[in-house]
């Protein structure tokens, strides 16, 4: 089996949570600028399943403010530029990893969280429950 | 912008590039009490832009295996089931954070990145450009 | 490639512990979980718990909650998977397995464990 | 906790046979599906994720098939080697797995 070596260039942890606890670094690899999915497309407007992006923001979690998608109808447009109630909007949901602050204000603090966020929307045909 | 107040109850660091290096309780809390919502729908096969689902899989990163959607068609589906080639399926893409460990094999460090992945794919009317 | 190797046979009385080892060779545990899945004899499959070496992340069924404890030590790779109060019905082949979260790709070759008294 | 039901629990095919394993889950699960494929006394092998990618190594004779409750597995000729019990497993929620489908020689 392989034993991993003790790098001499690894932070050390005396936490007695370790390993549960570990230093993170925060200078985020691959930064891309463009944060505000609005500015990156304009597929929220000509979707036939269009959205609305609201802002989440919490002060207490890394990202801060993250975009959620709410679909701008139950229907969805069709070629005429009508809503039709024959095929339904519905959200695209992505688990995505953030960080809270635990115990909450701690500047250097945080516990890895999973949460559910509302990416855009997509338009389907409904499922028809047929009644016995 | 937000202050946040020093609270005496922190873990304290004194690590030179605070705040970028921060301690993170890797136990993590789902939010998302009912299990996996992520996974339950099959919005990719009932969608007018349906996709597919790719493994991107890297075993040196959290989580080791990402889901991509690759859209099936360059068009959407119409009422007929056919591929209708006047709109457009598209990804719909998101930023998520992934932890890589830094230095490799440290089994206490971490560094936070930023992926662009696609989520799913949704039906647009395309951009049509008019030649003067 | 990745290879999972498990400890050997043990025969154990009702009421009493095992614990079960799985090493990892031919690469580290990386960051994929490690779950654990029991057969009894003639019987299908049921996973039990698992766990991110990584974070040391645990996630129990409901089923075994209380009585199974899973760990691993990075430092030589392996995780293990403790069972208390044994009893008769514990009798199985106890698997541990890669697991990404959606799929186990690499099994350990299994450890039979017998309660008897 | 998901239920996987299989079926049939068992079924008789020949060398060359097509042979079609059902599986069904009492809740929606999306594509979140697999199949394992176990020979007596060895650990279960993966053949197919996520309802229809074929593992690397996995022979083409097998496929999979299906979305949100029923799925099915796919040998499109049956091989010597194929004859084990085969295992659906769902990965929505914490796992399960179904009861085992055991393909025997005719």
């Known amino acids: 089996g392989i034993t991993i070596p003790r790098n001499p260039g690894c932070p050390n942890s005396e936490d007695k949570n370790f390993p549960r606890t570990v230093m993170v670094n925060l200078n985020i690899h691959n930064r891309n600028t463009n944060t505000n999915p609005k500015r990156s497309s304009d597929y929220y407007n000509r979707s036939t399943s269009p959205w609305n992006l609201h802002r989440n923001e919490d002060p207490e979690r890394y990202p801060s403010v993250i975009w959620e998608a709410q679909c701008r109808h139950l229907g969805c447009i069709n070629a005429d530029g009508n809503v039709d109630y024959h095929m339904n909007s519905v959200p695209i949901q992505q688990e995505i990893l953030v960080l809270r602050r635990e115990p909450p204000h701690c500047p250097n603090s945080f516990r890895l969280e999973k949460i559910l966020v509302s990416v855009g929307c997509t338009c389907v045909t409904p499922i028809v429950h047929h009644v016995q | 912008g937000i202050t946040i107040p020093r609270n005496p109850g922190c873990p304290n660091s004194e690590d030179k590039n605070f705040p970028r290096t921060v301690m993170v309780n890797l136990n993590i809390h789902n939010r998302n009490t009912n299990t996996n919502p992520k996974r339950s729908s099959d919005y990719y096969n009932r969608s007018t832009s349906p996709w597919n689902l790719h493994r991107n899989e890297d075993p040196e990163r959290y989580p080791s295996v990402i889901w991509e959607a690759q859209c099936r068609h360059l068009g959407c589906i119409n009422a007929d089931g056919n591929v209708d080639y006047h709109m457009n399926s598209v990804p719909i893409q998101q930023e998520i954070l992934v932890l890589r460990r830094e230095p490799p094999h440290c089994p206490n460090s971490f560094r936070l990145e930023k992926i662009l992945v696609s989520v799913g794919c949704t039906c647009v009317t395309p951009i049509v450009h008019h030649v003067q | 490639q990745v290879q999972l190797v498990q400890s050997g046979a043990e025969v154990k009385k009702p009421g009493s512990s095992v614990k079960v080892s799985c090493k990892a060779s031919g690469g580290t545990f990386s960051s994929y979980a490690i779950s654990w899945v029991r057969q009894a004899p003639g019987q299908g499959l049921e996973w039990m718990g698992s766990?991110?070496?990584?974070?040391?992340?645990?996630n129990y069924a409901q089923k075994f909650q209380g009585r199974v404890t899973i760990t691993a030590d990075e430092s030589t790779s392996t995780a293990y998977m403790e069972l208390s109060s044994l009893r008769s019905e514990d009798t199985a082949v106890y698997y541990c397995?890669?697991?990404?979260?959606?799929?186990?790709?690499?099994w350990g070759q299994g450890t039979l464990v017998t309660v008897s008294s | 906790d998901i239920q996987m039901t299989q079926s049939p629990s068992s079924l008789s095919a020949s060398v060359g046979d097509r042979v079609t394993i059902t599986c069904r889950a009492s809740q929606g699960i999306s594509n979140w599906l697999n199949w394992y494929q176990q020979k007596p006394g060895k650990a279960p092998k993966l053949l197919i994720y996520a309802a229809s990618s074929l593992q690397s190594g996995v022979p083409s004779r097998f496929s999979g098939s299906g979305s949100g409750t029923d799925f099915t597995l796919t040998i499109s000729s049956l091989q010597p080697e194929d004859f084990a019990v085969y295992y659906c497993q769902q990965y929505s929620d914490d796992p399960t797995f179904g009861q085992g489908t055991k393909v025997e020689i005719k």
């Open positions: 766990i991110i070496p990584w974070f040391g992340y645990t």
């Open positions: 397995a890669r697991d990404s979260e959606y799929y186990f790709d690499h």
